[in-house]
């Protein structure tokens, strides 16, 4: 069969071969699409609710006025000239919409380096056949489930016109020390060869690199943490960020209701005041920061210091990212 | 007998919008053919607006893509025209008509864009 | 864009003669099994009437005096003979990929 490819909504015409250019001409046309339940037979005669989907013409061509999805399928022509002789045509016709532009929607204008980050998600509507659609960075096609880029995709059909609606949600880990300005682009690709691909404009997000924090220090005076009855403990964080961060203070993991301030000062030590003690610096950059945590504790006279190995763990990192 | 009426306003505001109507009698816009919208300019020159398909998708002329709309309401047997941001250039008599062999057209209205 | 080009913009034709008008297309209209140009009547005051479909056929009702021919960029409609009510213009239009109309020949009876 010939393949014969239409745009929803165009004429087409479908050429009898064989047959004589006017009547009285033997032909008789077979269509097998979407609209029949199985082979339609059209004559030259035609008349009936057929003429406004498919009329055979003067010069026994088959005419569709206007084709739809429903008209995809085989037409088949079979026609004798004036001699006898026998003339078969067979096309197999199919037929395309051509969608809008695609666009990217709910573009980011920033990502952070090394962690994943959603670029977009471009949306292609109105096309038949569906087609596909494929991500480029800086030109270059970008491959799902490599070096960090996965991608989302959906595919919805239009109830009443049977158009196809795609979309395609483009995560990426930028890495470190990469470019900081990367142009995505994403195109649409028709399910029916000879047609070009269609391009979204490209984006250009800024990728952002965390700078790797500086430990918040935790020092305790005396050393180790342990004081007798009536002691004083000074409990002092150093932040090397500039601008100094506001300093909040933390004991056994509750916040205690003090303003900030870099210096905690524990004077005339009782039983209440002893346990788990930590800084928590907050930056406006990048959020707050825990030190490592310090045990306070009483020596009843006569007792040994503690060895600084009874000092806490080392702290709970950052805490959350701006 | 199949017939097409345009109808609308014949006055638009530059910038404003136009929407036009074209009612058809005698033949139901979702059974087949493609809907037209056509438009003639003062010096006669005929520009083919866009279509809506018998089963709703659409197409439009490439220079009008951004500013138009087609759509349509099967239970009144109605296919609209809007035409956004017009200007004076827009001034002309507007036409509907059934596509494939355009035979049928409406008798036109004209719509002048004026302050 | 396919742009269509009609000669001449006008002509003068005596009662009973040939008129002859020219259609060119900036690329192909056609296929191998047919040429999707087609061609109309119009006259003041009316919407322009179809004449000719896809290049050759007659549309039903209209005289046979009126005949189209021509495939790929080249097509013309003939007017023969000419009669009085023939004084119109008349456009060319394709419906290859998507649609366009000629210029005109504005058609005047001597």
């Known amino acids: 069969a010939q393949n014969i490819t239409a745009r929803i909504g165009e004429p087409l015409v479908l050429k009898c071969k064989g047959a004589p250019k006017k009547p009285p001409q033997r032909l008789e046309w077979k269509l097998n699409t979407g609209r029949t339940e199985a082979w339609k037979v059209l004559s030259p005669q035609g008349g009936g609710p057929w003429d406004s989907v498919a009329r055979v013409l003067p010069n026994g061509s088959l005419f569709l006025p206007a084709v739809g999805i429903q008209d995809e399928g085989i037409f088949r022509c079979q026609a004798m000239n004036r001699n006898g002789k026998e003339t078969k045509s067979n096309y197999r016709v199919r037929v395309y919409q051509i969608p809008g532009k695609p666009e990217i929607v709910d573009s980011a204008s920033e990502l952070t380096a090394g962690v994943p980050n959603k670029v977009g998600t471009c949306v292609s509507e109105g096309s038949y056949p569906a087609g596909t659609l494929s991500w480029h960075l800086d030109g270059k096609p970008l491959v799902p489930n490599e070096k960090g880029v996965s991608v989302k995709e959906q595919t919805r059909r239009h109830p009443e016109t049977g158009l196809f609606t795609l979309q395609s949600e483009l995560m990426v880990t930028p890495a470190r020390g990469g470019d900081p300005r990367p142009t995505f682009s994403c195109s649409f690709s028709p399910g029916l060869p000879r047609h070009r691909a269609l391009r979204t404009a490209p984006i250009q997000p800024r990728v952002w690199e965390p700078v790797p924090l500086e430990e918040v220090q935790l020092v305790v005076e005396p050393e180790g943490g342990a004081v007798a009855p009536g002691g004083t403990v000074t409990l002092t964080c150093e932040v090397p960020a500039q601008p100094s961060p506001q300093i909040h203070w933390m004991k056994d993991g509750v916040p205690l209701p003090l303003p900030p301030s870099p210096v905690l000062i524990l004077p005339e030590i009782g039983p209440q005041d002893q346990g788990t003690y930590s800084c928590v610096a907050t930056h406006s950059s990048h959020g707050p920061q825990e030190s490592r945590a310090v045990s306070i504790s009483i020596i009843e006279p006569g007792e040994e210091g503690p060895t600084a190995g009874s000092v806490g763990g080392s702290g709970l990192g950052t805490l959350a990212l701006a | 007998d199949v017939q097409l009426q345009e109808s609308g306003p014949d006055l638009v505001k530059p910038s404003q919008s136009l929407s036009l109507t074209c009612t058809v009698t005698?033949?139901?816009?979702?059974?087949?053919?493609?809907w037209h919208w056509i438009r003639q300019f003062p010096g006669n020159k005929l520009e083919w607006m866009g279509y809506i398909h018998y089963s709703g998708s659409t197409n439009y002329n490439p220079s009008l893509k951004s500013r138009i709309s087609i759509t349509r309401d099967t239970s009144k047997n109605q296919f609209f025209l809007q035409l956004n941001s017009v200007t004076t250039e827009d001034t002309a008599t507007y036409y509907c008509?059934?596509?494939?062999?355009?035979?049928?057209w409406g008798q036109g209205t004209l719509v002048t864009v004026s302050a | 864009d396919i742009v269509l080009t009609q000669s001449p913009a006008s002509l003068a034709v005596s009662l009973g003669q040939r008129a002859t008008i020219s259609c060119r297309a900036s690329?192909?209209?056609?296929?191998?099994?047919?040429?999707?140009m087609h061609w109309y009547q119009q006259k003041p005051g009316q919407p322009p009437k179809l004449l000719i479909y896809?290049?050759?056929n007659l549309e039903s009702g209209v005289p046979a005096r009126f005949s189209g021919s021509g495939s790929g960029t080249d097509f013309t409609l003939n007017i023969h003979p000419v009669e009085e009510e023939d004084a119109a213009t008349y456009y060319c239009q394709h419906s290859r990929e998507l649609y366009t109309f000629g210029g005109g020949t504005k058609l005047e009876i001597k």
């Open positions: 690329k192909s209209v056609g296929t191998s099994d047919s040429s999707y």
């Open positions: 005698g033949y139901s816009i979702t059974s087949g053919y493609s």
């Open positions: 008509a059934r596509g494939g062999d355009f035979a049928y």
């Open positions: 896809l290049a050759s």
